[in-house]
Interface confidence: medium
């Protein structure tokens, strides 16, 4: 996350780190007891690699009563997703067992009305991405506000060049924007999750780049088919 | 590139020992899962042997025609997989490929292959 | 083992029209992890085979849309909604749920 600051720690209890190897590797939101929705590109490199989820974290390395890493039973990518395109690039995790709910450990609703968020509407991004262009990786979750912006504009030729179709949204990136190691994270707009961050190698923290976002929304009947 | 280049095919007589070499370039080879695929002159394909990666203990497992003959090894640090076939038998002519295995456990890049004969 | 029965053989098809291989397996080809390991790969002549379809219905990078991949349990299907000059070849099904893995017999798809 570029130009936020640490979140309020267990405060999104709905949060994820998927982890490959132990270590982070992208964000992911809690949708049902044993699913945590991500970005598809995520796991494209995974290789023959061990991928486990993280819940009830706010600290990645410190001790944390709430922290419980989950072994994936099961990775299943949006049939469409593919690895050169920013098209229904979701994934679904299926935990080997149901988390453990608490106060730091909770599934956040989702946007099932398949309606556009209004552009200027205030938006939370959260995430252990990068927090800065020289790379650093912050241990502490951090978290920044947003403003939705309309689709004409993000499609401009200057910006995104009619790369956002109406399964994708966007949001501000005007020196504060997600990043790397954010993608697959949660987009929260009034306490529902509204978006997905994408995990394409788009420039962050530049206004003519603002961040993609996946829309849940337009995704509802597959992800009912999947947690079904 | 992502490139995958086997090597050390020939002709060798019923009984004989050989050992194919696969070169990985383009990619962590050490994160992957590799696998030999085969296909004899004129017919389909067939899985022979996988290996995994250091995070996997460097799992073997074998097709029922091959096991107790052939050992798969692996060497990360020259980015390079063998395939050791001893006790070779006519049947086991055939173009060898080496294949990586991605994530969602799919052969997503695929050798030109190496051709193994066996004949007395 | 699991046997992979794939059916036509030979597929003759006029360019532009739809094609369709069907591929059944001897027993269930859900992993135990709840994923169904199974793939389609073309082979064309004188190539080494190339990825199409994974886990049943997801289109591997740069495979266009007219190919499908549809089933489950044991019963799959790979459907090309209108044949292209590019895509004749030997197309094999593939599942990678079971040790040991085990291809299809292939289905050679053909100008008529």
């Known amino acids: 996350i570029l130009g936020g600051r640490e979140a309020e720690a267990h405060a999104r209890p709905y949060m994820a780190s998927v982890q490959l190897n132990g270590a982070h590797l992208c964000g992911g939101v809690l949708v049902a007891e044993q699913w945590v929705l991500s970005a598809a590109h995520c796991l494209e490199d995974a290789a023959d690699g061990k991928v486990q989820v993280l819940l009830g974290a706010h600290s990645l390395s410190q001790p944390e009563p709430s922290k419980r890493l989950y072994d994936v039973l099961r990775a299943v990518p949006h049939p469409d997703s593919q690895p050169d395109t920013i098209d229904h690039d979701l994934l679904l995790l299926q935990l080997s067992e149901k988390a453990t709910l608490g106060p730091a450990v909770r599934p956040l609703p989702w946007q099932r009305v398949d309606r556009d968020v209004a552009p200027g509407t205030l938006c939370d991004v959260a995430g252990w991405g990068i927090v800065n262009h020289a790379g650093r990786r912050p241990d502490s979750l951090q978290h920044v506000l947003l403003p939705v912006l309309d689709r004409a504009t993000c499609n401009r030729r200057t910006h995104h060049d009619g790369a956002i179709t109406e399964r994708l949204m966007c949001a501000e990136s005007n020196r504060r924007d997600s990043c790397k190691g954010d993608s697959g994270g949660p987009l929260v707009c009034g306490g529902v999750l509204e978006g997905v961050v994408t995990s394409g190698s788009r420039v962050c923290g530049n206004r003519k780049k603002p961040g993609i976002y996946t829309r849940v929304a337009s995704y509802a009947a597959w992800i009912d088919s999947v947690l079904a | 590139a992502v490139q995958l280049v086997e090597s050390g095919g020939g002709l060798v007589q019923p009984k004989g020992s050989l050992k194919l070499s696969c070169a990985a370039s383009g990619f962590s080879f050490n994160t992957y899962a590799m696998n030999w695929v085969r296909q004899a002159p004129g017919k389909g394909l067939e899985w022979v042997a996988r290996?995994?990666?250091?995070?996997?203990?460097?799992?073997?497992y074998y097709a029922d025609s091959v096991k107790d003959r052939f050992t798969l090894s692996r060497d990360d640090s020259e980015s390079m997989l063998y395939l050791q076939m001893n006790n070779l038998k006519t049947e086991d002519t055939a173009m060898y490929y080496c294949?990586?295995?991605?994530?969602?456990?799919?052969?997503?890049?695929w050798g030109t292959g190496t051709t193994v004969t066996v004949s007395s | 083992d699991v046997l992979m029965t794939q059916t036509p053989l030979s597929l003759p098809v006029s360019l532009g029209d739809q094609a369709s291989i069907s591929c059944r397996s001897s027993q269930t080809i859900v992993h135990s992890n709840g994923n169904t390991y199974l793939e389609w790969y073309l082979q064309k002549s004188g190539q080494s085979p190339k990825l199409l379809i994974y886990n049943v219905s997801n289109r591997f990078s740069g495979v266009p849309d007219r190919f499908r991949g549809s089933g489950s349990g044991t019963d799959f299907t790979l459907k090309i909604s209108r044949v292209e000059a590019e895509d004749l070849g030997v197309y094999y099904c593939?599942?990678?749920?079971?040790?040991?893995?085990?291809f299809g017999s292939g289905t050679k798809l053909e100008i008529k």
């Open positions: 294949v990586r295995q991605g994530f969602y456990w799919y052969f997503d890049v």
């Open positions: 290996i995994r990666s250091k995070s996997n203990n460097y799992a073997t």
């Open positions: 593939f599942q990678g749920s079971h040790v040991p893995y085990t």
